[in-house]
């Protein structure tokens, strides 16, 4: 070491280099001082004078000890999909990073040049690789026994809840729905148990695998508002019998109202002696289709008296959308004087013995010619344990609806036209056929 410290500028010893925070100026051939971060060289050194430094102007910076004639310009303002994680100062450049829910598709030395939104996995798909600051989410189909009912960039597939008795089997995009006995839960406490409304945003992945074929039951198991997340058991508290009873009572009241109205307008009845039969459909045929299982049960002339019945059945339909389509077949598709509901069956687990509950509710509305109304409500229900799933029921098994069906004749219609139209539009009214099976 030299005995005394040399002050800049100074000529270096041959073969040696300048000290830290100094640079060798080729013109002056001297070791000169560098400028500190936040400054730049305003005047370069000479043999007799050291470097003159000056502060960087606004929106410019120097991050290192330097001898640059001008400070560097800060990068442009962050775009709307970015957040400024480091502001532009005299000593550092602005740094933009992607905001939450986005990742950096094109990076630069510091921060990100181009952000892109994280891919969202649609229902039936879950996150198989979470996104990071620099990589996108990867979605994969939910494995058998798991589901995702959200459109999300963070949700993974979750196992279906385990039911003692399954009301609706789960599929890739929907959790299993249990009947009123408590299920065992695959999830940790606090997980949401019932399927939430699913979004249908488009997705950059393969098509969703086809959901399981079991159709949903119309209005027997209403999917009402989501239950609270914590402490919820995920089942329906009302017993099935009570729901059926209330439904039958409601239909009876509607029938009575119709009778009163028809009595007042003095319409004469036409009672059709005929037996309606509902065969059990295989599950694949029952899925979201209108087949022979839907029978013409009640025909009314287009009049104001049908509106209460129509809106009632419509409301019932709307309460439980089917799994494969936005809405169960409802009154929207039928004529002004018709009301519909749908029947369905749920397939039990393969090889399992399913407990099948068939419930049939029919309202017969008749009024006699002497204007004293005779209204009967007849419900035929068959309940029992079957050794096979509902879809394997014998072809000739029939559920009798009623020996008598009545239609009201309007001035425009004749018995022939009414009879002739019975083959055209299916018209079951709230006839749930729910297969309820142990898991």
């Amino acid at each position: 070491l030299p005995a005394q410290v040399a002050f800049t500028p100074y000529a270096p010893e041959p073969g040696s280099t300048c000290r830290l925070r100094e640079y060798y100026d080729q013109t002056a051939q001297m070791c000169c001082s560098k400028c500190s971060p936040g400054q730049h060289a305003k005047v370069f050194c000479t043999k007799t004078s050291d470097t003159v430094c000056d502060s960087c102007e606004d929106s410019t910076y120097t991050q290192l000890w330097n001898w640059v004639p001008e400070c560097l310009s800060c990068g442009s303002r962050c775009s709307s999909d970015q957040v400024e994680t480091q502001a532009c100062t005299r000593e550092q450049n602005r740094i933009c990073t992607c905001r939450p829910g986005w990742y950096c598709a094109l990076s630069k030395q510091e921060g990100c040049r181009l952000c892109a939104p994280l891919r969202k996995c649609r229902p039936g798909f879950g996150v198989a690789r979470p996104g990071t600051e620099t990589s996108d989410v990867v979605c994969k189909p939910c494995a058998p026994g798991t589901f995702s009912n959200t459109t999300s960039s963070t949700d993974i597939c979750r196992p279906h809840q385990i039911c003692n008795v399954v009301a609706i089997p789960g599929n890739a995009s929907m959790d299993a729905v249990c009947t009123s006995t408590s299920p065992t839960r695959s999830m940790a406490p606090g997980a949401v148990h019932l399927p939430q409304p699913v979004s249908t945003r488009s997705q950059h992945t393969q098509p969703t695998p086809e959901p399981s074929t079991a159709p949903s039951t119309s209005f027997l198991l209403p999917m009402g508002p989501s239950p609270p997340a914590e402490g919820s058991t995920g089942d329906f508290a009302l017993p099935v019998g009570l729901i059926v009873g209330v439904t039958a009572l409601g239909l009876l009241i509607i029938g009575v109202v119709n009778c009163v109205i028809m009595t007042q307008v003095k319409k004469k009845p036409l009672c059709l002696q005929r037996e309606a039969k509902v065969p059990h459909l295989p599950a694949d045929k029952a899925r979201g289709t209108q087949g022979p299982e839907q029978q013409h049960l009640l025909i009314t002339a287009p009049s104001s008296s049908s509106s209460s019945l129509e809106s009632s059945a419509s409301a019932l339909d709307r309460r439980a959308p089917t799994r494969n389509q936005p809405q169960a077949p409802g009154v929207e598709a039928s004529g002004a004087g018709e009301a519909r509901a749908s029947t369905g069956s749920s397939d039990s687990s393969p090889g399992g013995h399913g407990t099948q509950v068939n419930v049939t509710c029919i309202v017969n509305v008749c009024s006699s010619s002497d204007h004293s109304s005779q209204c009967s409500s007849q419900a035929s229900s068959t309940m029992g344990d079957t050794d096979s799933s509902p879809s394997e029921s014998p072809k000739d098994e029939q559920v009798p609806f009623s020996k008598e069906e009545c239609a009201f004749r309007s001035q425009l219609e004749t018995p022939e036209t009414l009879l002739g139209s019975t083959e055209e539009k299916p018209l079951p009214l709230g006839v749930p056929d729910a297969g309820m099976k142990p898991s």
């Epitope: 198989a128 690789r129 979470p130 990867v138 994969k140 494995a143 993974i156 979750r158 940790a188």
Partner: antibody, heavy 118, light 110 residues
Amino acid sequence: QVQLVQSGAEVKKPGASVKVSCKASGYTITDFYIHWVRQAPGQGLEWIGRVDPEDGNTEYAPNFQDRATMTTDTSTSTAYLELSSLRSEDTAVYYCSTWDGFSYFDYWGQGTTVTVSS
Amino acid sequence: EAVVTQSPATLSLSPGERATLSCRSSTGPVTTNNYANWVQQKPGQAFRGLIGGTNDRAPGIPARFSGSGSGTDTTLTISSLQPEDFAVYYCALWYRNHWVFGGGTKLEIK
């Protein structure tokens, strides 16, 4: 049914490479990642990496970043693990698997014993 | 590099007892993004995934198995041990782009 069938046992010299195969059947191979895990004699499990058969993207454990190569051939539904610059410490049973904490698709190969000795 | 430590290395219990297996992350709290993962290994049998995701039991896994997590630890609890539960259990945690397994816990009959 779903199966992952691995290739047979291998004996290699130090410095050599080994390539283990894993043939998937009973499902669409592109639907789930394939993981490679190994277990040295009397030791625990060690995660090597995983490959997405759909696009070939890979993720490796830091220890295997330089020596392991995972690939897939979707036409034959087969995944491969190649391990280079073998050392005696690489003697282990190597397993392919579809299980991870994201998918719950729980299938494992029967394992391939790789022995590295001079 | 992240290290996942399982404890105890060996746990001796009797059927009917409750087993608590711990898994600790060296890199700070185990968040939901670590996606704790438990695997069972029985001699001469295929591995079996037990718990995944955010402490969910895999399909078909009995209810006596449960996962939980707080702070740097994630825990596997077997509420009432059955004879078939005696095995080696591994946990794995997800670290941004890779899984790291713990050293395993051997659950043996007392």
